[in-house]
Interface confidence: low
């Protein structure tokens, strides 16, 4: 808000106006207007000669503004010369600007028909178990005036959940300075916001418009089961579609999949609605939408609609999701060489082939740098010549490998270590 | 909008579930839930043994998730072992998750009481001189159904100037697919925007809620005098203040200062309201506000209010805004030296003192680097010794300097130049 007292000089012509005289024969005035203003209105410099006589002053366009700066980028400077025969030390000239046509607007205001009652103040919320009491006050001027009485007023309370828009807010009318919101008005475990405005009661002798809205007040509604889907609403388009929407907490939706189920009559079979469309609703909720077909509204005029957890199942076929137990591994020495031998837990089904992956490495290497061998249905493997006086490690894992059977590698067997013997020197 | 078919696997437990068996004695399952979901609901892994038998699976917390990645930062991994005696190549296990309590909500929808009529389409505007015709269409399904008929519907047209909020928009009701907006509805030279929604007519057998709003349509109202102040509105608070506001184009406000004038009765004197508060309104307008005191609403119930250009005057006192005509300057040579002589235009008032500012310089210098002298009431000045064989320039200006008189310097006189004589050599 910018504030200006009546009389504050604020227009560009008046700001830029400077007049100097030679104290002998003439007064020279300079001022500027803007190109933008000129498109809509032209103003004329007016000199007030005396109380009754206003004279327009003839001015020419000018190239410069030596006496003042113009506070606008597109100024149009002007210069005016006013002949003047006599100058006295007490002389004061009064200059103003006049638009080129009458500008203005007029209104006859009958107070009784142009009332905007005062807005409610001190809006507060207090709670009594699962009921919430909104209270406020309204200043009606001095009691002795009685021009506007409480009987002329009513209050419009609008309230909504934080995530909803005011356009979809619910309205409650009250003819006192309070209103109660109970479980029938509020969804549990939700943050609500309310505001109130004063309006003229229908039976009042007064008319006008409602007050401004009060500041808002916020509160949390009665606690409830936050995992429950909320706000299931369905509306029929009058033709062939019943559109339903409901809301679920985002965290719950990540763990429980809800579906919309419907029956066109109590004894009909239940069907699931598809597809379901989802949209975010604030940071906490997801809104779901689904359209139920209504082939015959005249015959089936009542639908039973429910939101329930969907039995979303994962089908896992045993024969292609096998992970065998890890083999047990041993190291044996045969003369100068070493062998790895392993056993698998006995399977009930002999016909299933096994693939083994064997890894061995020096103690100083990592498994990533190990030697890897793959063998089919074998239970041992002779190791090639190894470096003497070195510690080695080995491990083995297994998976099924017959057509029609599949799965993932078993865990690795427990790793085994051994030290190779030192080689005697040749001397 | 995100779309999901009924049956799409979307929950984190189902996404992360992996089950592998050793094809001999047991199945191992791993899955994850989120900490956030656990605050609100716990889910249990369920194995469907056959069509009728669902068995909960006992699971333990786990440190890792070797078989799948969790798409959430705060996952809680679990591992479950299910003993199993027989495996057949055709075996399929069916797994799902079940919340720890019944979740869901239910609604019985009577179609006649849950109607949301279709939203208007093809909203268009056409013009006939200063009247604007809004037309739209609405799809009511197949004509043979007749479930929802045109008689069940009415249309709510809301319209506003572009810069106003929808909350303050005007409403027009129509029981056909058109509405006319004339000069009584629209301010001239303004851009308007309108939208329409369908609602159930008061006399209809149906109930529910209005349709969504149609897309908006924009148009420019009938041309008018854009310099005129617009939208003068006044509302009485019922106690002691009549608050008025009006709007002016920003360009016009820069050149014409408007005031709010009021009379508490037709024969009372007109007074000006102060202070006026201003605020921007879109890019083109400024809204002005002022509060008129209403000392006695019972006696004076009708105020005549007008917005008019204010006679904002600038008072300019002649004797302190003098700019004399520039002096006329001559250069004379007296023997070896030079003098400057000037004359001022004769003033009618001999008693007014004059101050002169004299500047002289070499031809090669600028006025900025010139020598400057100031003299009181003198009309000549002897120049000091000058360099020989050099061109010089001089100029003079004047201002009044008597107490009680003031102003600004005159323009500079016309500059005069002269060449100094060459000095004969000494030999």
């Amino acid at each position: 808000w910018e504030r200006s007292l009546a009389g504050a000089e604020e227009t560009i012509p008046l700001q830029t106006l400077r007049c100097y005289n030679d104290y002998t024969s003439h007064i020279t005035c300079r001022w500027a207007d803007t190109q933008d203003a000129q498109r809509l209105v032209n103003v004329t410099l007016i000199r007030r000669v005396n109380e009754d006589l206003l004279e327009p002053v003839s001015c020419d366009l000018s190239d410069d503004m030596p006496w003042s700066a113009c506070p606008h980028p597109r100024c149009v400077p002007r210069r005016c010369v006013i002949p003047c025969q006599s100058f006295v030390v007490t002389d004061v000239d009064y200059f103003s600007f006049q638009p080129d046509r009458p500008l203005g607007t007029r209104l006859t205001v009958t107070l009784t028909q142009h009332v905007q009652p005062p807005e409610p103040r001190d809006l507060q919320i207090s709670t009594d178990q699962d009921h919430f009491l909104l209270t406020w006050s309204v200043a009606l001027g001095s009691p002795q005036s009685h021009w506007l009485s409480p009987g002329d007023l009513e209050f419009e309370v609008v309230y909504k959940r934080l995530q909803d828009s005011w356009e979809d807010a619910a309205i409650l009318l009250s003819n006192t300075s309070q209103a109660t919101l109970g479980p029938e008005h509020l969804m549990p475990s939700s943050t609500y916001v309310a505001r109130v405005r004063t309006r003229l009661a229908p039976g009042s002798r007064l008319s006008g418009r409602p007050s401004k809205w009060s500041p808002e007040v916020c509160w949390d509604s009665q606690p409830g089961d936050e995992a429950q889907p909320q706000n299931l609403e369905c509306f029929f388009d009058g033709a062939a579609v019943l559109s339903c929407s409901w809301e679920v907490r985002k965290e719950v939706a990540s763990s429980v999949s809800f579906g919309l189920f419907y029956k066109p009559s109590p004894d009909a079979g239940e069907e699931e609605c598809s597809p379901v469309l989802r949209e975010g609703l604030g940071s906490l909720h997801t809104r779901h939408h689904c359209q139920i077909p209504v082939p015959d509204p005249a015959t089936h005029g009542q639908y039973i609609v429910s939101v329930q957890p969907r039995r979303a199942e994962k089908h896992i076929k045993s024969s292609v999701n096998i992970q065998m137990a890890p083999p047990s591994l041993n190291v044996t020495k045969d003369g100068d060489s070493y062998s790895l031998r392993w056993e698998t837990m006995k399977m009930r089904y002999e016909h299933i082939d096994h693939t083994f992956e064997i890894q061995y490495r020096k103690d100083t290497a990592t498994w990533k740098d190990s030697k890897t061998e793959t063998l089919q249905n074998a239970h041992s493997m002779a190791l090639p010549a190894l470096e003497p006086s070195t510690r080695y490690w080995a491990r083995v894992r297994v998976r099924t490998s017959r057509t029609g059977y599949n799965g993932i590698w078993s865990e690795w067997s427990e790793a085994r270590s051994w030290d190779t013997e030192s080689v005697l020197p040749m001397w | 909008w995100e779309r999901s078919l009924a049956g799409a696997e979307e929950t984190i437990p189902l996404q992360t579930l992996r089950c592998y068996n050793d094809y001999t004695s047991h199945i191992t399952c791993r899955w994850a839930d989120t900490q956030d979901a656990q605050r609100l609901v716990n889910v249990t892994l369920i194995r469907r043994v056959n069509e009728d038998l669902l068995e909960p699976v006992s699971c333990d917390l786990s440190d890792d998730m070797p078989w799948s990645a969790c798409p959430h930062p705060r996952c809680v991994p679990r591992r479950c072992v299910i003993p199993c005696q027989s495996f057949v190549v055709t075996d399929v296990d069916y797994f799902s998750f079940q919340p720890d309590r019944p979740l869901g909500t239910r609604l019985t929808v009577t179609l006649t009481q849950h109607v949301q009529p279709p939203e208007p389409r093809d909203l268009q505007i056409s013009t006939d001189q200063d009247h604007f015709l809004l037309t739209w269409s609405v799809a009511l399904g197949s004509p043979q159904s007749h479930w929802l008929s045109p008689g069940d519907l009415e249309f709510e047209v809301v319209y506003k100037r572009l810069q106003d909020s929808w909350e303050d928009a005007a409403i027009l009701l129509s029981n056909t697919s058109q509405a006319t907006l004339g000069p009584e509805h629209l301010m001239p030279s303004s851009t308007y925007v309108a939208r329409v929604r369908t609602r159930l007519a008061p006399g209809s057998r149906l109930s529910g809620r209005p349709s969504k709003w149609s897309p908006e349509v924009c148009w420019d109202s009938q041309p008018g005098d854009e310099a005129q102040p617009q939208n003068l509105e006044c509302f009485f608070d019922g106690a002691a203040v009549l608050s008025c506001s009006w709007e002016v184009r920003k360009e016009v406000a820069s050149s014409v200062s408007f005031g709010l004038f009021y009379k508490p009765s037709p024969d009372a004197g007109e007074e000006e309201c102060s202070p006026v508060l201003r605020e921007g309104l879109g890019s083109l307008h400024t809204r002005h506000h002022c509060q008129i005191p209403v000392p006695d609403p019972a006696t004076h119930g009708q105020y005549i209010v007008s917005v008019q250009p204010r006679r904002a005057e600038k008072h300019i006192k002649s004797s302190v805004n003098i700019q004399m005509a520039p002096p006329s300057l001559n250069v004379t040579k007296d023997g070896d030296s030079y003098s400057l002589r000037w004359e001022t235009m004769k003033m009618r008032y001999e008693h007014i003192d004059h101050t002169f500012e004299i500047q002289y310089r070499k031809d090669t210098a600028t006025w900025k680097d010139s020598k400057t002298e100031t003299l009181q009431n003198a009309h000549s000045m002897a120049l000091p010794a000058l360099e020989p064989s050099t061109r010089y320039w001089a100029r003079v200006r004047v201002r009044t300097s008597r107490t009680g008189y003031n102003g600004i310097w005159s323009e500079w006189s016309e500059a005069r130049s002269w060449d100094t004589e060459s000095v004969l050599p000494m030999w």
Partner: antibody, heavy 124, light 105 residues
Framework: QVQLVESGGGLVKPGGSLRLSCAAS????????MSWIRQAPGKGLEWVSF????????YYADSVKGRFTISRDNAKNSLYLQMNSLRAEDTAVYYC?????????????????WGQGTTVTVSS | EIVLTQSPGTLSLSPGERATLSCRAS???????LAWYQQKPGQAPRLLIY???SRATGIPDRFSGSGSGTDFTLTISRLEPEDFAVYYC??????FGGGTKVEIK
């Protein structure tokens, strides 16, 4: 029943004065705006003046402005029209009428109750 | 000042016929502000229609009003003998139209 009865008409010379009265009964007079309407012989209806329920708001037709004064006394359920500087063209039947009630004055319910009229003749 | 012009000046019809009376305003009038009256010789006028289209209490449904902006219409669907009279339109609390006389043909 709801009724309006005018009185005070008669013959008067140009420049003279008359005071018409309208007595209301059968409704809450103080809730309603009231009007005077006249009808010159063989001519149409011409609105003369109206007054708001409280008496604060008053309007006159240009043809009578400055000569006629409308007033009401809610305690007596009466409406008045003081006519000064009468002219020949003021000759007419004068009706008082009630404006249909509405809490919102931007809606007009018409003049729903009329008196039977009183005749004013201005002639020398 | 708004001027209301009624046409035709006289309408000659037989009982049972449909009568359509027109009222045209010199500038746009809110339909909320337009009323129609019936006046029979020697009687006070009687309110028929207010708000351009709403019937006053006790008015038969053969009388209907319509229109908006500058053009308004009073329609009598089937003339009864008691409907032959002069009809006036009126804007808000003030201006009346010149009247249309509906006479028996």
């Amino acid at each position: 029943q709801v009724q309006l009865v005018e009185s005070g008409g008669g013959l008067v010379k140009p420049g003279g004065s008359l005071r018409l009265s309208c007595a209301a009964s059968g409704f809450t007079f103080s809730d309603y705006y009231m009007s005077w309407i006249r009808q010159a012989p063989g001519k149409g209806l011409e609105w003369v003046s109206f007054i708001s329920s409280s008496g604060i708001i008053i309007y006159y037709a240009d043809s009578v402005k400055g000569r006629f004064t409308i007033s009401r006394d809610n305690a007596k359920n009466s409406l008045y029209l003081q006519m000064n500087s009468l002219r020949a063209e003021d000759t007419a039947v004068y009706y008082c009428a009630r404006r249909g009630y509405s809490g919102y004055d931007y809606y007009y319910y018409g003049l729903d109750v009329w008196g039977q009229g009183t005749t004013v003749t201005v002639s020398s | 000042e708004i001027v209301l012009t009624q046409s035709p000046g006289t309408l000659s019809l037989s009982p049972g016929e449909r009568a359509t009376l027109s009222c045209r305003a010199s500038q746009s009038v809110s339909s909320s502000y337009l009323a129609w009256y019936q006046q029979k010789p020697g009687q006070a006028p009687r309110l028929l229609i207010y708000g351009a289209s709403s019937r006053a209490t006790g008015i038969p449904d053969r009388f209907s009003g319509s229109g908006s902006g500058t053009d308004f219409t009073l329609t009598i669907s089937r003339l009864e003998p008691e409907d032959f009279a002069v009809y006036y339109c009126q804007q808000y609390g003030s201006t009346f139209g010149g009247g249309t006389k509906v006479e028996i043909k």
